[in-house]
């Protein structure tokens, strides 16, 4: 499977941006660092790797976005939106938002000032 | 058809310099980060350099860090090694090479090659 | 600086026998971030396995990939001529992005 290529439309816009982007390795940054050593995520194994990995990956992704508190809040959306489903309860989910408002301060990028997480209607 | 073509390669002094040219065609160049791989005769690959698509992020191998910069034109589907201060270790074959991503699950690989240009340095 | 370790250097078999090719990292490395590439004399590398284990497009399933952490396998379940060539390991996580050594496979 592969990215949708050139697509139309305001190629400035954030919605192009994160289309653009490859969050999984911030998804799994994230999943490592509340899961630690507790299971195994999609068809890779997060319990014996280092974070640093899909850190790195993380914020090149995330640094090729036009560094606006827009861009990014809709880039954590994304992110939260992607991994709903996974999150198994709420202490969970309260975690994983946790470490996606933190993710931005770990890439040193100014993260945003409101980002409202809530996504995929309330769920989570 | 997808192609990426490498030039610039040649004989060169030691200390000498020389820029490496790569051109991409047949997809949206600006979409994918690049890479630049080299391999010494009768020896393995290695990893040379890499660049975002927006050039915002550069990383470089510790042995050319310093002496070599990796550079692109979007707007010319170009990517580009300029190389100084030419060393012996430095003889190889170059070659570009485009990084893409699995959307679906995220892992990263080089899936189109140039064919290389060859860089000698000797005196 | 992560360091590949490819074993062993030169794998000798003949068509039709299983060949298990070895990448040991010396330190761990997400599978996500594990690449195999084949190499012919005179040629450009050639994508094989990228996530530690997904085939890349058009390549045969008698290739397959597996491990984690810091040990990664390739495994070509019935050599095929073709297949006689160089293969590298990559981890692409962590720059700089080291490749191993190679593991020549001949035949025999």
């Known amino acids: 499977m592969r990215r949708e290529r050139g697509r139309q439309g305001d190629s400035s816009s954030c919605e192009r941006q994160v289309d653009r982007v490859n969050l999984k390795p911030c998804e799994q940054h994230i999943m490592q660092r509340i899961m630690g050593e507790q299971e195994q995520y999609d068809s890779y194994d997060i319990r014996s790797t280092r974070s640093s990995d899909q850190q790195q990956r993380c914020c090149d992704e995330l640094n090729e976005m036009e560094n606006t508190q827009r861009c990014m809040c809709e880039a954590l959306q994304q992110i939260m939106e992607n991994q709903c489903d996974r999150l198994q309860d709420r202490q969970m989910v309260q975690q994983f938002k946790r470490e996606l408002m933190n993710l931005p301060q770990q890439c040193n990028f100014r993260a945003p000032q409101r980002c409202d997480l809530d996504v995929s209607g309330g769920r989570c | 058809e997808v192609q990426l073509v490498e030039s610039g390669g040649g004989l060169v002094q030691p200390g000498g310099s020389l820029r490496l040219s790569c051109a991409a065609s047949g997809f949206i160049f600006s979409d994918y980060n690049m890479n630049w791989v080299r391999q010494a005769p009768g020896k393995g690959l290695e990893w040379v350099s890499s660049?975002?698509?927006?050039?915002?992020?550069?990383y470089y191998a510790d042995s050319v860090k310093g002496r070599f910069t990796i550079s692109r034109d979007n707007a010319k589907n170009s990517l580009y090694l300029q190389m100084n201060s030419l060393r012996d270790e430095d003889t190889a074959v170059y070659y570009c090479?485009?990084?893409?991503?699995?959307?679906?699950?995220?892992?990263?690989?080089?899936?189109?090659w140039g064919k290389g240009t060859t860089v000698t340095v000797s005196s | 600086e992560i360091v590949l370790t490819q074993s062993p250097g030169t794998l000798s078999l003949s068509p039709g026998e299983r060949a298990t090719l070895s990448c040991r990292a010396s330190?761990?490395?997400?599978?996500?971030?594990l690449v195999w590439y084949q190499q012919k004399p005179g040629q450009a590398p050639r994508l094989l396995i990228y996530g530690a284990s997904t085939r890349a497009t058009g390549i045969p399933d008698r290739f397959s990939g597996s491990g984690s952490g810091t040990d990664f396998t390739l495994t070509i379940s019935r050599l095929e001529p073709e297949d006689f060539a160089v293969y590298y390991c990559q981890q692409n996580g962590n720059s700089p992005y080291t490749f191993g050594q190679g593991t020549k496979l001949e035949i025999k």
């Open positions: 330190q761990s490395v997400s599978n996500m971030f």
């Open positions: 660049i975002t698509r927006s050039s915002r992020t550069i």
């Open positions: 090479a485009r990084e893409d991503f699995d959307v679906s699950t995220g892992p990263y690989y080089m899936d189109v």
